[in-house]
């Protein structure tokens, strides 16, 4: 079952080349989701971004850049605990059909060795829509800084929709958030991948409604085990 991805509200273009592990998952030429390069063969994204086949854009902040690498991928592995009903365990590994060429513009993301605490400033990035509910898709990668929010504070907003492997981030009284097209993309804190864009309130950018992310630090064992198993 396919689902459309998500984009960045109230952000700005990322500093060029500052996110060399950021990828776009395309369906044909159309943006489907974001993702991150874990190593030369693997991309990590959200489970709700599942498709039969992917075209992976790497190595350029600009979608459609002819200098970018485009690699097909036809194998993907959802977390076995992913639920389309509760949206828990919303992560998936996509295996590239051929290896990515690492360079200054194509680098592996650092997986976390610990879970960062509430209050930590992080950056979320993506090519998702910059407007909502009507969409405006940028060609350049967008970034916005947000802060991690405690589960207790986030539960006040989302109540029983929030599960313990979900991570919330936002800025009080601000529109800064991810949106359609950003799904599966990275939330990076202190140089490590802490979250993958999972879901949030629509229309996007409603003040005091945090973005919800898959908390990557809870899944490093599954990520490493899955890549080993399907080498």
């Amino acid at each position: 079952e396919e689902a459309q991805g998500d984009k960045i509200i109230d952000g700005a273009p990322c500093a060029r080349g500052s996110h060399p592990w950021q990828v776009a998952l395309l369906s044909g030429n159309q943006l489907h989701c974001g993702g991150v390069l874990v190593n030369e063969r693997w991309v990590l994204t959200a489970a709700h971004c599942k498709m039969n086949e992917y075209t992976v854009h790497l190595g350029s902040d600009t979608l459609g850049d002819r200098r970018a690498q485009r690699i097909k991928a036809s194998k993907s592995f959802r977390h076995p605990g992913y639920s389309t009903q509760t949206h828990v365990n919303d992560l998936m590994l996509v295996k590239l059909n051929s290896q990515a060429r690492l360079s200054s513009m194509v680098k592996k993301v650092r997986l976390p060795s610990r879970c960062e605490p509430p209050g930590t400033t992080c950056t979320v990035s993506g090519w998702g829509t910059t407007t909502s509910p009507d969409v405006t898709f940028p060609s350049d990668l967008m970034c916005v800084d947000v802060k991690l929010i405690s589960p207790q504070d986030c539960t006040k907003v989302y109540k029983d929709l929030l599960e313990n492997s979900m991570l919330c981030a936002g800025i009080p009284d601000s529109k800064k958030n991810a949106c359609n097209g950003d799904s599966g993309g990275p939330l990076v804190c202190r140089g490590t991948l802490q979250g993958l864009v999972s879901w949030g309130t629509f229309p996007c950018g409603q003040p005091n409604d945090p973005g919800v992310y898959t908390q990557v630090c809870k899944f490093t064992k599954w990520i490493n085990d899955t890549m080993k198993k399907h080498r």
Epitope: H48, T129, S132, D134
Partner: antibody, heavy 128, light 108 residues
């Protein structure tokens, strides 16, 4: 202003397939985050949700009708369609197309949406 | 499937009356409830979503409240244009979207 308009035959024979199209004007199906759905209302009765589709083609059907329903989208024509097979007199109803406004984006989007814009409806009678 | 039960099925009222319609869900739907108004021969029109959020362009005399399993639609001062049938709809479950049976508001 967004408008939806249903079209299709008003009379269908039993056991045949009912086919309806909804044309969207004043906005583009392919450049939005909305869902597009079909609801029906038998004469003198209440409303029944048939199913919905996202612009990317993800479909969600009422389990009671799932085996007979197909909803598809044609973004180039800004239309979405309903096909209901093996119809009987019980399928006689006014059929409405509507836009579904999601409450969330991303993983949670397709479970929480309400119908905020409706077409005028088209009457379909199943009779030989 | 989640069943939605509306009461009363018919309500007789006069212009200026305060009118309350109740909708009960067979299980908790949090605040995922919408209210629609339908006039004879016309399509339903969205009034309220997320239990209490007023749709743009809808008069402020309409209000919604409730959460969990019990919800109400209130018309603070009934106007001639408000005589119609009202439906609640739950959209907060993994089962299909379901509507209540309707409440017809008629002139007393």
């Amino acid at each position: 202003q967004l408008q939806l308009q249903e079209s299709g035959p008003g009379l269908v024979k039993p056991s045949e397939t009912l086919s309806l199209t909804c044309t969207v004007s004043g906005g583009s199906i392919s450049s939005s985050s909305y869902y597009w759905g079909w609801i029906r209302q038998p004469p003198g009765k209440g409303l029944e949700w048939i199913g919905s589709i996202s612009y990317s083609g993800s479909t969600y059907y009422n389990p009671s009708l799932k085996s007979r329903v197909t909803i598809s989208v044609d973004t180039s024509k800004n239309q979405f369609s309903l096909k209901l097979s093996s119809v009987t007199a019980a399928d006689t109803a006014v059929y409405y197309c509507a836009r579904g406004a999601p409450t969330y984006f991303g993983a949670a989007s397709h479970y929480y949406y309400y119908m905020d814009v409706w077409g005028k409806g088209t009457t379909v009678t199943v009779s030989s | 499937d989640i069943q939605m039960t509306q009461s009363p099925s018919t309500l007789s009222a006069s212009v200026g009356d305060r009118v309350t319609i109740t909708c009960r869900a067979s299980q908790s739907i949090s605040s995922w409830l919408a209210w629609y108004q339908q006039k004879p021969g016309k399509a339903p029109k969205l009034l309220i979503y997320k239990a209490s959020s007023l749709e743009s362009g809808v008069p402020s005399r309409f209000s919604g409240s409730g959460s969990g399993t019990e919800f109400t639609l209130t018309i603070s001062s009934l106007q001639p244009d408000d005589f119609a049938t009202y439906y609640c709809e739950q959209y907060g479950s993994y089962s299909p979207l379901t509507f209540g049976g309707g409440t017809k508001v008629e002139i007393k």
